[in-house]
């Protein structure tokens, strides 16, 4: 079996990306320059911790969670790397296009890259439903079009909605999540025969993909909390948010046990089950009043995983084609909309605690933005697949899906690796 | 008593800088995300610009954008205001204020300006 | 965004007053977390209401916010004379905020 990629892409790829490195380099010469003011070098720390703690979610805890298949590990983890870092670049410039522009350059601070790795994670999110069916030439393109794609949603809701960094950000989930399961249902779907182990997953990258969740689980705070503008929001969010991601972890492990006949625990189900809670109380996580709250929540989160994870797969994969172990895309699609919803339902308690029309016009808008992040998704995510499917980016063929010696130099060329 | 304390205004030429303050006393700043509001001669407020609790995220409004740099130190509890390339329609009363924010409805928290200084004159002439 | 207020309003005292703020944008909604101000001469503003109908602690009880209509409104209910000022609305847009024009009430 030959590790070298196909002589087209080997062309095609590097051509690709280093123009387009180029070109973002050019851009950043151009129209960017450094935020000029750093009076409080404590609060600088403080900042880039933050931001820190997002790129650990990002680089490590989803690029080991989508690690597990038998075959693609190296793939996936690399992979997630190469997105981020391009996703982060473009995201910067995006976001400063579109909201600092009139101003001539657009201003780097901390909180930018901030923002842009929340952007990049967006990516990360949906590239679960495809990794293994794409090469790096297709990956470049999902990356560019959803960052783009993301990144007018979050300034259009902004703009119509009247809404806040934090608020227009948490729909990342049902938009990633849709915006994933459309493009992965545009790729080909059946697997040749004898390759079906390939998307099985493995002890040792299953177990990575166990550290990924663990670091996505021990950030996801930060990640809620990141764009709140004021200290007691923030509090609240990293109270809510680890409330929620703790009682997530008790329900998926336990819950995994109830479903499985023998009472066993599937690893894929914890994988993604872990993190329910966080998913869950996204949009009103600095809003909910108490721990209780979020712990129900974090329980309702965790039982709907696991569910999902049990019933979802099989239609997933005959309609997707998606991998049983890739499960982020409907888990995230399920859990982003609850967590959309219990925002409403606060929304509708408001309207009948105040009896104000206004706040039942709330809850329209809300679910307008809802409605909106849905659509985009799903239409940028076709508009997507139909890209990948060009003949262009030389795909790999159905036969070399999830194969790591595909993309990869191993020396050794160890046969069942 | 709550206060916030404006300093640093005076008279500049067209296309100089100045650099105003507003130290704050008896609160601590951190708490706080914190506003630059001015008044032209004559003429209503004009919000300028605001910056978060921690100093990471900065808004401007539109005229102001690129000329003027929001920042702050909260181990010296002061907020500053860079102002360069002034205008003369950058001539008026400037103010700092601090930004509250409440969880008056289950899904809402509010943001108000509720603590004013006194304001500083800033004059752009030549 | 233009945030549009009636310029001037006179009103006798013990009498009832509404002032309005609209945005150019649309329909005024608690998202935009409305804010009155008052502000003699020579004095620095002083805030009266946030989140449309909340009052300050210094906020005396005649003084009532509200949505109406699409706008935002501050209503001054038993006007004394010493509440002849120059009154401000403050909208808040998507991180950033604007203030109205003023109305100068004058009291008679």
């Known amino acids: 079996m030959s590790s070298k990629y196909p002589r087209s892409v080997r062309r095609c790829l590097p051509l690709w990306a280093l123009t387009l490195e180029a070109a973002l380099i050019l851009l950043f010469y151009f129209f960017t320059h450094y935020d000029a003011s750093l009076e409080d070098q404590k609060g600088l720390v403080a900042s880039y911790q933050v931001g820190q703690d997002l790129t650990v979610m990002a680089a490590i805890g989803l690029g080991f969670l989508t690690s597990s298949f038998r075959r693609h590990s190296w793939s996936s983890v690399a992979f997630n790397l190469f997105m981020l870092a391009l996703g982060v670049q473009w995201a910067i410039l995006l976001d400063g296009f579109l909201s600092q522009f009139p101003s001539g350059k657009v201003v780097i601070t901390l909180f930018s890259i901030r923002l842009a790795t929340m952007s990049a994670l967006s990516v990360l999110i949906s590239v679960d439903a495809v990794l293994g069916k794409v090469n790096l030439a297709q990956l470049v393109v999902m990356v560019l079009v959803e960052v783009t794609a993301l990144g007018n949603l979050r300034m259009v809701i902004s703009n119509i909605f009247n809404t806040d960094y934090h608020m227009n950000m948490m729909h990342i989930y049902v938009f990633a999540a849709y915006f994933g399961l459309s493009v992965a249902w545009c790729l080909p779907k059946p697997l040749p025969e004898g390759t079906e182990d390939k998307d099985q997953t493995a002890t040792i990258p299953s177990l990575s993909a166990m550290l990924g969740a663990l670091f996505l689980w021990m950030f996801w705070p930060s990640f809620n909390s990141a764009l709140l503008r004021s200290p007691i929001e923030r509090k609240n969010a990293v109270f809510n948010t680890y409330y929620a991601v703790a009682v997530s972890v008790v329900t998926a492990i336990s819950g995994s046990s109830l479903a499985h006949p023998q009472g066993k625990i599937s690893k894929t189900y914890v994988h993604s089950a872990v993190l329910a809670g966080g998913v869950a109380v996204g949009t009103s996580c600095h809003l909910i009043p108490s721990p209780w709250l979020a712990m129900v929540l974090g329980l309702v989160a965790g039982l709907i995983s696991v569910g999902g994870a049990k019933y979802l797969p099989g239609c997933c994969n005959r309609v997707l084609g998606i991998p049983h172990s890739s499960i982020m895309g409907y888990n995230f699609s399920l859990l982003g909309l609850l967590g959309e919803i219990i925002y409403i339902v606060l929304l509708v308690l408001d309207t009948v605690g105040a009896g104000n029309g206004m706040i039942g016009f709330q809850v329209l808008l809300s679910i307008g933005e809802l409605s909106l992040a849905i659509v985009i998704a799903l239409m940028s995510g076709l508009l997507t697949g139909l890209l990948l499917n060009l003949k262009i980016w030389k795909a790999p063929h159905e036969a070399k899906y999830f194969d790591d010696q595909v993309f990869w130099k191993f020396p050794h060329l160890a046969v069942g690796f | 008593e709550v206060q916030l304390l404006e300093s640093g205004g005076g008279v500049v030429q067209p296309g100089r800088s100045l650099r105003l303050s507003c130290e704050a006393s008896?609160?601590?700043?951190?708490?706080?995300?914190m506003h630059w509001v001015r008044q032209a001669p004559g003429k209503g407020l004009e919000w300028v610009a605001f910056?978060?609790?921690?100093?990471?995220?900065?808004y401007y409004e539109d005229s102001v954008k690129g000329r003027f740099t929001v920042s702050r130190d909260n181990s010296k509890n002061t907020l500053y205001l860079q102002m360069n390339s002034l205008r003369a329609e950058d001539t008026a009363v400037y103010y700092c204020?601090?930004?509250?924010?409440?969880?008056?409805?289950?899904?809402?928290?509010?943001?108000?300006?509720?603590?004013w200084g006194q304001g500083t004159t800033v004059t752009v002439s030549s | 965004a233009e945030l549009t207020q009636e310029p001037s309003l006179t009103v006798s005292p013990g009498g009832t007053v509404t002032l309005t703020c609209a945005s150019s944008?649309?329909?005024?909604?608690?998202?935009?977390?409305p804010n009155w101000f008052q502000q003699k001469p020579g004095q620095a503003p002083r805030a009266l209401i946030y989140g449309s109908n909340n009052k300050h602690s210094w906020t005396p009880a005649r003084f009532s916010g509200s949505l109406l209509g699409g706008k935002a409104a501050l209503t001054l209910s038993g006007v004394q004379p010493e509440d002849e000022a120059e009154y401000y609305c403050?909208?808040?847009?998507?991180?950033?905020?604007?203030f109205g024009g003023g109305t100068k009430l004058t009291v008679l």
């Open positions: 204020a601090r930004e509250l924010s409440k969880k008056v409805a289950l899904s809402r928290y509010y943001y108000y300006m509720d603590v």
């Open positions: 944008t649309g329909a005024v909604t608690s998202r935009y977390f």
């Open positions: 910056i978060w609790f921690d100093g990471s995220n900065k």
């Open positions: 403050l909208l808040f847009y998507a991180g950033a905020w604007a």
């Open positions: 008896k609160f601590t700043l951190y708490n706080y995300g």
